[in-house]
């Protein structure tokens, strides 16, 4: 996790209402330019449909807990998830699904059918992404669900499977 | 549509040139930090190649009219559209196309071929997205065109079909 | 390339440490609201796996040189590339790959298998995108590699193949 001191970090903006008087830097810091973001890669070992993530990714103004990104500053967030699948085709088609959940509610999902020819081939790659623009309150959780988690390629390409959020406009 | 009072809303930034003198908050509000955004889901019933959208989505500093997002503040916009298709495969391949139009001109399109095996299967899911970064002037229209609109899955997955724009950098 | 004068352009922010005293506009301009972005379309004629781009696209606070975007201002960048493929299917499946490279290191890749039925068809369209959120230093290079560059559709759809970056949060 990066710990660089970044201007306008949510951590160093004084609370509104404090005494700022004519201190221009203080006034500027109070201005609504907060930034929050996260970029996490999938955990190496997946054993359930709710994906887990490596908490040593980029986290700034967002917490990670038990497979969830937890929002710390309210506002309008852009959320994007991208997954790389590697499917050993059975003799039927396979529907790959990616669900974005907000507070455990499905807000958006993407589906793609692979192995549609019904032929057993060595492997089929598929890349699936999903984005969402939504107002999120403090303590809102963001998570990802994948029915066919066994097809997520975590051994060769763990870095390709990511969940990212960033604050577009805060609503203090 | 959210009506929360959001700092730096295009609606409450005073016009430049007004008398601000030493009012720091006024000066800050004049600073170029405007934000505009939209996030609309596809209308339930589609009957033409130009897609219609639910106007009760998120709209802030952008208008919706007759299938178009209409820009109200000039600047550099990030535009992204994502569509979920569900195709009842005929006995030939099908090309799915998503066109992003600016002022009725095609600015970007994405194509994916499905049902390529030529076998009539129950269904094939496909997810298609397209983004664009472009300078847009006031009253510019943003719209989406899809040849095969009958395959857009508005019944099972109406929330998956979205058009979103947000202002990255204003150009006042 | 757009040359509009855009507020808070990296070009017109005075260096920190200069004497600003009580000049509020000067103070505001010093505040960390720099923006940098690029949006380039693929070059018409590709002859190697490292893609080349049309340098007459949108470039602001980012340079283009020899197939690379070169970062001029440090910070957290959102990087996104989208490519449109048109594959004349041989009698075997084809793996399409898109790699995002930072300083010649693979940071993220996307793979999709097409022509999986093994049938020689007229053509198959496939659209592939990849994004990355990363901290980039000054002079960092961003480039794109595609093993099967011969399948990138530069003739019918040159505008669909784009590389874009934008600064989300600067780190001055």
């Amino acid at each position: 996790q990066r710990t660089d001191s970044i201007p306008n970090s949510p951590d160093n903006i004084p609370l509104r209402g404090g005494n700022c008087s004519e201190d221009l830097l203080c006034i500027l810091k109070r201005a609504p330019f907060k930034k929050s973001w996260a970029y996490l890669q999938v955990a190496k070992h997946l054993n359930k449909t709710k994906l887990s993530w490596n908490k040593d990714g980029i986290l700034h103004g967002v917490r990670y807990q038990d497979g969830n990104l937890v929002i710390q500053f309210p506002g309008l967030y852009f959320i994007i998830c991208q997954l790389q699948f590697l499917v050993q085709c059975p003799n039927n088609s396979v529907d790959l699904k990616l669900e974005l959940l907000i507070n455990k509610h499905i807000k958006k999902q993407a589906l793609v059918t692979v192995c549609e020819s019904g032929m057993q081939t060595k492997h089929v790659y598929q890349n699936l992404s999903q984005f969402l623009l939504d107002y999120l309150q403090v303590n809102t959780t963001v998570s990802v669900n994948v029915d066919t988690f066994q097809y997520i390629d975590t051994s060769t390409f763990p870095l390709e499977n990511v969940l990212s959020v960033f604050l577009y406009s805060n609503s203090d | 549509q959210r009506t929360d009072s959001i700092p730096n809303s295009p609606d409450n930034i005073p016009l430049r040139g007004g008398n601000c003198s030493e009012d720091l908050l006024c000066i800050l509000k004049r600073a170029p930090f405007k934000k505009s955004w939209a996030y609309l889901q596809v209308a339930k019933h589609l009957n033409k190649t130009k897609l219609s959208w639910n106007k009760d989505g998120i709209l802030h500093g952008v208008r919706y009219q007759d299938g178009n997002l209409v820009i109200q503040f000039p600047g550099l916009y990030f535009i992204i559209c994502q569509l979920q298709f569900l195709v009842q495969c005929p006995n030939n391949s099908v090309d799915l196309k998503l066109e992003l139009l600016i002022n009725k001109h095609i600015k970007k399109q994405a194509l994916v071929t499905v049902c390529e095996s030529g076998m009539q299967t129950k269904h094939v899911y496909q997810n298609l997205s397209q983004f664009l970064l472009d300078y847009l002037q006031v009253n510019t229209t943003v719209s989406v065109n899809v040849d095969t609109f009958q395959y857009i899955d508005t019944s099972t997955f109406p929330l998956e079909n979205v058009l979103s724009v947000f202002l990255y950098s204003n150009s006042d | 390339q757009r040359t509009d004068s855009i507020p808070n352009s990296p070009d017109n922010i005075p260096l920190r440490g200069g004497n600003c005293s009580e000049d509020l506009l000067c103070i505001l301009k010093r505040a960390p609201f720099k923006k940098s972005w690029a949006y380039l379309q693929v070059a018409k004629h590709l002859n190697k796996t490292k893609l080349s781009w049309n340098k007459d696209g949108i470039l602001h606070g980012v340079r283009y040189q020899d197939g690379n975007l070169v970062i001029q201002f440090p910070g957290l960048y959102f990087i996104i590339c989208q490519l449109q493929f048109l594959v004349q299917c041989p009698n075997n499946s084809v793996d399409l790959k898109l790699e995002l490279l930072i300083n010649k290191h693979i940071k993220k890749q996307a793979l999709v298998t097409v022509c999986e039925s093994g049938m020689q068809t007229k053509h198959v369209y496939q659209n592939l995108s990849q994004f990355l959120l990363d901290y980039l230093q000054v002079n960092t290079t961003v480039s794109v590699n595609v093993d099967t560059f011969q399948y990138i559709d530069t003739s019918t759809f040159p505008l669909e193949n784009v590389l874009s970056v934008f600064l989300y949060s600067n780190s001055d």
């Epitope: 051994s155 763990p158 870095l159 | - | 490292k50 010649k104 290191h105």
Partner: antibody, heavy 124, light 110 residues
């Protein structure tokens, strides 16, 4: 400390299939990709291909049509099969550990751990 | 995929420095910073001495250094010693997600 040991028949008849196994000890096979390399007597190294537990394989284009690789995680082994062999396939065959993934990036070390090699002769 | 090009042989006296070049294409050395170098003594398995163009694995002498320019990578051995006499191979990752080796260079310490 990770160690690799190749095993398999030292003599294979022309047109038959060469089968080799590499046993990994001192570490998990799941955390890396694994390669096979060969070296004909007095000549240079030739990379044959790479495998991993995901089933994702990459092969030298010149050998692709004849090569199959796989991983057996339960035995901590990976294997090479090369069919339709000829005298030109006579060589010392090495197994090696390939690239690593850590700390939010890929590390393309090349082959950082090697087996001692096994000689395979193709002859009738 | 074509092999990378190395000189068949180089030689030097103890204490001298020598450089071995390795030339590839824009789809391997020119594309990635994924060049590695191996030392192989007769009858032994190769040993990794440089990875990712310039990095030395732990335990490898700092007399070995790597560099790169354009489509060419180089291995420099300074303060040549008798035990450096061996075959040296360069290798690069390629755009096809494969590795390609050089033909090898025989280093003779005079």
């Amino acid at each position: 400390q990770v160690q690799l040991q190749e095993s398999g028949p030292g003599l294979v008849k022309p047109s038959e299939t060469l089968s080799l196994t590499c046993t990994v000890s001192g570490g998990s096979i799941s955390s890396y990709s694994w390669s096979w390399i060969r070296q004909p007597a007095g000549k240079g190294l030739e990379w044959i291909g790479r495998t991993s537990t995901s089933g994702r394989n990459n092969y030298n284009p010149s050998l692709k049509s004849r090569v199959t690789m796989s991983v057996d995680t339960s035995k901590n082994q990976f294997s090479l099969k090369l069919n339709s062999v000829t005298a030109a396939d006579t060589a010392v065959y090495y197994c090696a550990r390939d690239f690593t993934i850590a700390a939010r990036r890929y590390y393309y070390y090349g082959m950082d751990v090697w087996g001692q090699g096994t000689t395979v002769t193709v002859s009738s | 995929q074509s092999a990378l090009t190395q000189p068949a042989s180089v030689s030097g006296s103890p204490g001298q420095s020598i450089t071995i070049s390795c030339t590839g294409t824009s789809s391997d050395i020119g594309l990635y910073n994924y060049v590695s170098w191996y030392q192989q003594h007769p009858g032994k398995a190769p040993k990794l001495i440089i990875y990712e163009v310039i990095n030395r694995p732990s335990g490898v002498s700092n007399r070995f250094s790597g560099s790169e320019s354009g489509n060419t990578a180089s291995l420099t051995i300074s303060g040549l010693q008798a035990e450096d006499e061996a075959n040296y191979y360069c290798s690069s990752y390629t755009s096809s997600s494969t590795w390609v080796f050089g033909g090898g260079t025989k280093l003779t310490v005079l």
